[in-house]
Structure formats: C-alpha cells, structure tokens
C-alpha cells in the first residue's frame, strides 16, 4: 500500500538506508512530500514485524517497486493510489 | 556472535525419514528467519525454505513442498527440519542460516552443515 | 522461479590480480542479490548483500555493483585465502535462488 501524508510536522527521518528490503517483509509505504518543515521528500516504510526504517527516495530498489505498485493499482482499481491525509 | 550448532551426520535408508536440528546460541535476536539451503556433492546451494520463530510463519521452495517440513521450538532456540520419503536425489549436506528481518535479509549466519547419505 | 546465471563455472587468476565474476537475474531483481564465498568443506559465508553493501568485517577488496538483471562482484586484489567458490543469490523474492558458482582458482 502506498500512502501520501501531508503533515506539518519537521522531517521525519533522522537517518535513511538504501538497503534492499524484500516485499515479503513490507507492510506498507508512507511517502512524506518535501514541504511544510521538511525540505525533502521522505519515504517511510513499515514492515511487517512492526518495525519502521527510512528509505532513501534515491534508493534505485525503492523507485522501482513504487513504480511497479502505481502501475499495478492503476490497472485494477479505479480510485487513485495515493490516499491524502491532511490534518 | 550468533552460532548455530547442527545435528550430526546421518545414513538413511532409501524410504525412511530423517529429522535435523540446528540450535541457535549466542545474541539471537526476535526478529530473524531460519533458512534451510541443500547442497548436494559438488553442486549449488538450493533454498528449501524458511520458518520466522516469532510467529511459526513458514514459507516453503515449492520443489520441497512434500519432502521437507520445517518447525521450531522457540523456548529452546532449536528449528528442525524433517526429510521424508528419502531416495538418493535426497542425498547431501543441509544447512541451516539465519538473517535477521531489521537489515541485512541476506543469510549472514550458517550453520556447519549437516550430511545425509541416503543407501541401502 | 528466477534464475540466476553464473557464466563462468571457473576463472583462473593470480594473486594480485583483479578478477570480475559476473551474475545475470532472468528478471529484474531490482537490488536485491547477495554474494557468498565458500571454501572446501565450510559453509557459505555472506560478502555483500542488496547488490553493492558490503558486509560487516568482509575486507574493501571485495565489492558488489549492478541492479536490475546484471551484477558483478570484483575483488580488486586477489589474495590466496580467496581461492573459493562464489555464489550470487537473488533475495528479490521467494523461493529464493542462487546461481551455480564461479570456482576462482590460481591459474
């Protein structure tokens, strides 16, 4: 599941991987746009033992698999993939 | 330091079964998986599955669906894997590795190996 | 399942030379492979995983690139003790494969 959050909140991540991170193990994505506090862009994935590691948005693993889940919930569902949350 | 400690080495006969332990020790963390890989003689490594402790999840290499099963027994840090109906293709030296969810999701730790000789 | 491809079973190298094995995924894998070493009567050790990360105390000569279907992993100076067989994984997805070996051997 990927997530858009707009918050106005400062930045979330502290500290960011590039580290591979197999699907099996990804509960969801939350993707934080830069602004609002934060000037990047951060991506925030969830996993499913209930841990939570920031994902560099340069990672090339992390660019492709949203790539592939965007196409994926485009064709089989007729609302957007991006659920926005403002507070 | 993690060390897993497997069971000794096994001669079977053709049709019987044959159950293997590998026992982890030292710092072993929560969230890890127990991967079994076969090696037959001078070949690959081929993933026959893997059991996360913490919640019995097991997912099987469909080509071993069958022939092997894996458990665990979580208050001793031991998993097992159970070998049935064994011909010679069964032949071969076991491994147990772990790696942990939080990072690597690469098999960092390995046990020494465990040799089954399936023969009549 | 995905296969991976060592193309070479064995490579002849001296020491001191740099020597490139080299890993095809017969699909996109994205980052996720792992390489291992093994020596003759040991089990696998893990050297890099998610494509180019080296694992903890493996020495800087040993060092992994690629994504997507093509990986490499170099040692830039060959020392005795890495005469072995090395094993690329995918860790992209389950079952989990590996390829055949590349056996490095002194020439």
């Known amino acids: 599941v990927l997530e858009v959050y707009y918050t106005s909140l400062r930045c979330r991540c502290v500290q960011e991987s590039s580290v591979f991170i197999p699907r099996r193990f990804i509960d969801r994505i939350q993707i934080l746009p830069r602004g609002n506090g934060c000037p990047r862009k951060e991506i925030i994935v969830w996993k499913k033992n209930k841990s939570i590691v920031c994902v560099d948005p340069q990672a090339e693993w992390i660019q492709r698999m949203m790539e592939v889940l965007r196409k994926r919930s485009s064709s089989t569902l007729p609302v957007p993939v991006f659920k926005r949350k403002i507070p | 330091e993690v060390q897993l400690q497997q069971s000794g080495p096994e001669l079977v006969k053709p049709g019987a079964s044959v159950k293997i332990s590998c026992k982890a020790s030292?710092?072993?963390?929560?969230?890890?998986?127990m991967n079994w890989v076969k090696q037959s003689h001078g070949k690959s490594l081929e993933w026959i599955g893997d059991?996360?402790?913490?919640?019995?999840?097991?997912i099987y290499n469909q080509k071993f669906k069958g022939k092997a099963t894996l458990t665990v027994a979580k208050s001793s840090s031991t998993a097992y894997m159970e070998l049935r109906s064994l011909t010679s293709e069964d032949s071969a030296v076991y491994y147990c590795?772990?790696?942990?969810?939080?990072?690597?999701?690469?098999?960092?730790?390995w046990g020494q190996g465990t040799s089954v000789t399936v023969s009549s | 399942d995905i296969v991976m491809t060592q193309s070479h079973k064995f490579m002849s190298t001296s020491v001191r030379d740099r020597v490139s094995i080299t890993c095809k995924a017969s699909q996109d894998v994205s980052t996720g492979v792992a390489w291992y070493q093994q020596k003759p009567g040991q089990s696998p050790k893990l050297l890099i995983y998610?494509?180019?990360y080296r694992y903890t105390g493996v020495p800087d000569r040993f060092t992994g690139s690629g994504s997507g279907t093509d990986f490499t992993f170099t040692i830039s100076s060959v020392q005795a003790e890495d005469l072995a067989v090395y094993y690329c994984?995918?860790?992209?997805?389950?079952?989990?494969?590996f390829g055949a070996g590349t056996k490095l051997e002194l020439k």
């Open positions: 030292g710092n072993t963390l929560t969230d890890y998986y």
């Open positions: 998610s494509a180019s």
């Open positions: 059991i996360n402790p913490n919640n019995g999840d097991i």
């Open positions: 590795a772990i790696y942990y969810d939080p990072y690597y999701h690469a098999m960092d730790y």
């Open positions: 994984q995918q860790q992209y997805s389950v079952p989990l494969t």
